[in-house]
Interface confidence: low
């Protein structure tokens, strides 16, 4: 499986809410034995591989904020953890998974990145990220609403496997 | 509470492959979030950041020695593995396992560490 | 590689004295971590995220700094802080520490 990133860029004013998006793309096993843990978290641009640190959003870290759960299956964050810090991740039938963040401030902008790790008899079998930039924009120049560009089909379905 | 022991050979040849086993207690790698790193420090000088694991089996190298190390667990006996192909003298160091716990209360810092183990690499 | 610049790399103070060390990093880090090392020990966690204190560690102690410039400070320097501290970053791989500043007491 993959995980594409529909939009690569958001640029939002500050105060908006926003919702990141990753899906994950191509046959995904449904065993009782396979289950999938998808989460978020910061990371650098400037890194040598992309998303490979892994840093807080909003001092929630990636652990506080994934979601386990088979397959296709839908599921959200509910925790009031999660809540206080206005954000929440969550994740459809169809295989997108997102977190939403609101109030954004300029603190905010930065490099986001969504894990998917494929779990098999709890074991880790297979990993992919997808990354894609925030930024948080204040004064005349800021958009009125969030504006979002889509990321080129290369880039859509950029995998990167541990 | 949580302790880390680094246990190594002490004395190597060049050219020998180095062992290195951290055996830690009060945390379990199998927990989302916890990872171990190894780190070398030469006698008298400055640490040197090797490899770090997590606890899903993902791994980080220092590429300058990436072809010469291999990070490992086995997080049912509480144990990480480092071996280091090929030593010679420049390795001759103090090695140490620290834990990283990305967590929310105190995220991404090494909160523990092992005593260290001295390596001499001597002809 | 993200070299880690740490100065000065020897310092002394008498006690009660505010004291500064800096690290600078050739390209910008996120934030920075700090060590501190007597010894014959391990090192011991003393900064993290910037400007976080470890537990333990006493509140005369404080980190700040962006970008590619950080320090850290003792407000009233005491005998027992004398020891080698070290930054660190984990912005990318690898994960660099500074060489060292090592503080002496007067």
């Known amino acids: 499986f993959k995980v594409a990133t529909p939009y690569s860029l958001y640029v939002c004013p500050e105060g908006q809410n926003v919702t990141l998006t990753c899906r994950l793309l191509g046959p995904v096993d449904k065993g009782h034995d396979v289950t999938f843990y998808k989460t978020w978290y910061r990371s650098s641009r400037g890194e040598v591989q992309t998303c490979s640190e892994r840093r807080p959003i909003r001092n929630l870290t990636f652990q506080d904020l994934h979601l386990h759960h088979g397959g296709h299956q839908a599921a959200n964050t509910s925790h009031d953890l999660a809540q206080r810090h206005g954000l929440e991740s969550a994740s459809d039938h169809h295989g997108n998974f997102s977190i939403t963040m609101r109030n954004l401030t300029l603190l905010d902008s930065g490099l986001y990145c969504c894990l998917v790790v494929e779990i098999r008899h709890h074991h880790s079998e297979h990993r992919v990220h997808g990354a894609m930039e925030l930024q948080v924009q204040t004064g005349k120049d800021a958009p009125s609403n969030c504006v979002v560009y889509p990321s080129s089909s290369q880039d859509s379905e950029n995998i990167t496997a541990a | 509470q949580v302790t880390l022991k680094v246990s190594g050979p002490g004395i190597l040849q060049p050219s020998q492959t180095l062992s290195l086993t951290c055996s830690f207690s009060?945390?379990?790698?199998?927990?989302?979030?916890?990872?171990v790193s190894w780190i070398r420090q030469p006698s008298g000088k400055g640490l040197e950041w090797l490899a770090h694991?997590?606890?899903?089996?993902?791994?980080r190298y220092n590429p300058s020695l990436k072809s010469r190390l291999t990070i490992s667990k086995d997080s049912s006996s509480n144990q990480v593995f480092l071996k280091i192909t090929s030593v010679d003298t420049a390795d001759t160091a103090t090695y140490y396992c620290?834990?990283?716990?990305?967590?929310?209360?105190?995220?991404?810092?090494?909160?523990?560490w092992g005593q260290g183990t001295t390596l001499t690499v001597s002809s | 590689d993200v070299v880690m610049t740490q100065t000065p790399a020897l310092m002394s103070a008498s006690p009660g004295e505010k004291v500064t060390m800096t690290c600078s990093a050739s390209?910008?880090?996120?934030?920075m971590y700090w060590y501190q090392q007597k010894p014959r020990s391990s090192p011991k966690p003393w900064i993290y995220?910037?400007?976080n204190l470890a537990s333990g560690v006493p509140a005369r102690f404080s980190g700040s700094g962006s970008g590619t410039s950080y320090s850290l400070t003792i407000s009233s320097m005491e005998a027992e802080d004398a020891a080698t501290y070290y930054c660190?970053?984990?912005?990318?791989?690898?994960?660099?520490f500074g060489g060292g500043t090592k503080l002496e007491i007067k």
């Open positions: 620290a834990r990283r716990l990305d967590g929310y209360n105190d995220p991404y810092y090494f909160d523990y």
């Open positions: 390209s910008s880090v996120s934030y």
């Open positions: 009060g945390f379990s790698l199998s927990t989302s979030g916890m990872g």
């Open positions: 995220l910037t400007s």
């Open positions: 660190q970053q984990w912005n990318s791989n690898p994960y660099t």
């Open positions: 694991i997590y606890w899903d089996d993902d791994k």
